[in-house]
Interface confidence: medium
């Protein structure tokens, strides 16, 4: 049970960090050429 809880926590942490990064990547792109390949 303890092991399961730890695994779930790790997965949540990873998901959260990925989401934060993804949002910040998209956020930054908005301030620049927003379709990098469409020139």
């Amino acid at each position: 049970k303890h092991k399961c809880f730890r695994k779930e926590l790790e997965e949540n942490e990873t998901l959260e960090s990925i989401m934060n990064t993804a949002e910040s990547e998209e956020e930054l792109k908005k301030y620049f050429y927003y379709l990098e390949g469409s020139k």
Epitope: E25, Y31, F32, Y33, E36
Partner: antibody
Framework: QVQVVESGGGVVQPGRSLRLSCAAS????????MHWVRQAPGKGLEWVTV????????NYADSVKGRFTISRDNSKNTLYLQMNSLRAEDTAMYYC???????????WGQGTMVTVSS | DIVMTQTPLSSPVTLGQPASISCRSS???????????LSWLQQRPGQPPRLLIY???NRFSGVPDRFSGSGAGTDFTLKISRVEADDVGVYYC?????????FGPGTKVDIK
Amino acid sequence: QVQVVESGGGVVQPGRSLRLSCAASGFTFSNYGMHWVRQAPGKGLEWVTVISYDGSNKNYADSVKGRFTISRDNSKNTLYLQMNSLRAEDTAMYYCARGGSGFAFDIWGQGTMVTVSS
Amino acid sequence: DIVMTQTPLSSPVTLGQPASISCRSSQSLVRSDGNTYLSWLQQRPGQPPRLLIYKISNRFSGVPDRFSGSGAGTDFTLKISRVEADDVGVYYCMQTTQFPFTFGPGTKVDIK
């Protein structure tokens, strides 16, 4: 050709306001984030503010937060910088720059000079 | 804020000889997308800045191949293989990895 042209600079007293404009041509203005960068006389470059391509996102340097407002009118291909509560330390050449591919400032205007003095 | 430092701050060079400018950031400029958003700008006397290099080593259109950029992480270099009279001015490195975007103090290149 691809260019941006700033206007609206001048001499203004401390505490007063000024609005700068940047007219863009030669590219699809609504596809690009746009920036203001300033340079005090004899000094280096300082990033001031940015607005996203659609105007929905803005970010400011701490030194101007709460005093300066960036905006854009994509129908007029024009970028603006509303500067309120001006201080002597805001005296600088103000450049408009396009945010280009590779997150770099790829097109710069000639600048417009703002002097804050009593 | 990410602090950018440059060395040297002044560089007297001989025409036809190489020149090198170093730029260091206070933290890594690598973003999670794997890219490093470090650019180099040239400002000739009385002129606005002009983009030379973006993403460490990519030359912007119209920039002569005498200019090259290299580096990784926190340490970057701009090299001019053979300095010409036209190259006189101030060179700035700049990071666009994280808000607020920041510039180096600039390196003044002039002819000996």
